[in-house]
């Protein structure tokens, strides 16, 4: 095992900026921090096959799949996607690791699938497998929160029936007018579904997930109806 190269697989997620970078590139565009994909040796596979955690991205996202190889000497490589071979230009970083990158621009269904990277080094040959799919955001919803009084307790539950499950927070303000803006020092935020002590002149519950944030204001009349 210690004879095998140390492989690091990362995903780089790019902010969409209509850059005209080619499909396979050694120098990806300016982007967010690399995200480790937990590359692991695939058990019971013929040959040395590493697999990266499954990548799930939004449609139209631009990403880079990148492999860093800690192996002595030169490396040569080849990308294969849906039976097509794609050229590969490895380069070396400051730590003398071989770096191989595949840039996928504006992700579409046709670009989803298995990306195989074949690497040949002086010591050994191995394959790295990336699986890229498009996240199904059609199922995502963000609904405005509503309130329910807890049975036998002097407490309120804030509910938002959203997918993925939202983060729910109470926003409480004990002041009048302008000073109840969210950045105001008069505002108290509690990131919990259940509120045990009601205080303030302005009480709201907010739910947020990947689709954004929705808030509902609690009026005194609601307390009698929940």
């Amino acid at each position: 095992n210690q004879d095998l190269p140390v492989i690091k697989c990362v995903l780089i997620n790019h902010k969409n900026n209509d850059s005209s970078v080619g499909k396979s590139s050694s120098y990806p565009m300016v982007s967010e921090s690399p995200e480790d994909l937990g590359c692991a040796l695939r058990p019971q596979s013929s040959g040395t096959v590493y697999e990266a955690a499954a990548v799930e991205v939004d449609v139209s996202a631009s990403i880079t799949l990148q492999v860093l190889v800690d192996a002595p000497g030169n490396i040569s490589c080849l990308w294969v996607f849906k039976h097509s071979s794609l050229n590969c230009q490895p380069h070396f970083d400051l730590q003398n690791r071989g770096v191989v990158s595949m840039v996928i621009l504006k992700m579409t269904e046709t670009q989803a699938g298995e990306y195989l990277l074949f690497i040949q080094s002086e010591a050994t040959n191995y394959t790295i497998l990336f699986t890229v799919s498009i996240r199904n955001t059609l199922l995502y919803t963000l609904r405005r929160p509503y309130f329910r009084k807890m049975e036998n307790q002097d407490a309120l539950v804030c509910i938002s029936e959203s997918v993925p499950e939202p983060i729910v927070e109470w926003v409480l303000c004990d002041s009048q007018g302008e000073s109840c803006k969210e950045e105001s020092p008069a505002v108290v935020k509690k990131e919990e579904k259940v509120l045990h002590e009601l205080f303030g002149t302005d009480i709201r519950c907010c739910a947020r997930n990947e689709l954004g944030r929705e808030c509902t204001r609690l009026f005194t009349i609601d307390l009698n109806q929940t």
């Epitope: 994909l37 937990g38 990266a52 499954a54 990947e210």
Partner: antibody
Framework: QVTLKESGPVLVKPTETLTLTCTVS??????????VTWIRQPPGKALEWLAH???????SYSTSLKSRLTISKDTSKSQVVLTMTNMDPVDTATYYC???????????????????WGQGTMVTVSS | DIQMTQSPSSLSASVGDRVTITCRAS??????LGWYQQKPGKAPKRLIY???TLQSGVPSRFSGSGSGTEFTLTISSLQPEDFATYYC?????????FGQGTKVEIK
């Protein structure tokens, strides 16, 4: 570099609710099939799996503690939160969070368990 | 729930010894098993996954075998840094469960 860091109260009173936060860096809970799990270890005892949550919001809980546990994630803060209600002195333990990468198997996913762990946070339950 | 029974619960050995730890599952778990090493005051570290695949960076003196209900962790030649507690973990079905641990001590 992949890191996970647990944070939360050092001391909790019996019957109170414990809220623990796992802040992750070096990997994402959005763009890859990744999970975060919670494990605990009472002093001098074995490891006990508590719960986990995946990037697709799939969750699982320990059978014996299911009624007391809630796991959630806040991807914008790269955090996973575990709450445990009605704490008791027997819940005194070191609580760890760890990462679980998910690998594609056709239309399904496969997990090899936890590959990277946080350093743990000790929680004492006492009045 | 699947019960994982580890044996022995502790053992004494000398540097250079061959050490074998066994983990038995109460029902078949294919090869959905990992081995973890834990040193006092530290977090566990994965040694083996999928019953027999060595984690990257782990010395080759560690090896795992087995499938179904019987699994083994072997340290071919015990080194001073190997004195620790070892746990097996099944991740075949929920809830995931650990063995009770095997403490490897210096003879």
């Amino acid at each position: 570099q992949v890191t996970l860091k647990e944070s939360g109260p050092v001391l909790v009173k019996p019957t109170e609710t414990l809220t623990l936060t796992c802040t992750v860096s070096g990997f994402s809970l959005i763009n890859a099939r990744m999970g975060v799990t919670w494990i605990r270890q009472p002093p001098g005892k074995a490891l006990e799996w508590l719960a986990h949550i995946f990037s697709n919001d799939e969750k699982s809980y320990s059978t014996s503690l299911k009624s007391r546990l809630t796991i959630s994630k806040d991807t914008s803060k790269s955090q996973v939160v575990l709450t445990m209600t009605n704490m008791d002195p027997v819940d005194t333990a070191t609580y760890y969070c760890a990462r679980i990468p998910g690998y594609s198997r056709g239309w399904d996913y496969y997990y090899y368990g936890m590959d990277v762990w946080g350093q743990g946070t000790m929680v004492t339950v006492s009045s | 729930d699947i019960q994982m029974t580890q044996s022995p619960s502790s053992l004494s050995a000398s540097v250079g010894d061959r050490v074998t730890i066994t983990c038995r599952a109460s029902q078949g778990i294919r090869n959905d098993l990992g081995w973890y090493q834990q040193k006092p005051g530290k977090a566990p570290k994965r040694l083996i996954y999928a019953a027999s695949t060595l984690q990257s960076g782990v010395p080759s003196r560690f090896s795992g075998s087995g499938s179904g209900t019987e699994f083994t962790l072997t340290i071919s030649s015990l080194q001073p840094e190997d004195f620790a507690t070892y746990y097996c973990l099944q991740h075949n079905s929920y809830p995931w469960t650990f063995g009770q641990g095997t403490k490897v001590e210096i003879k």
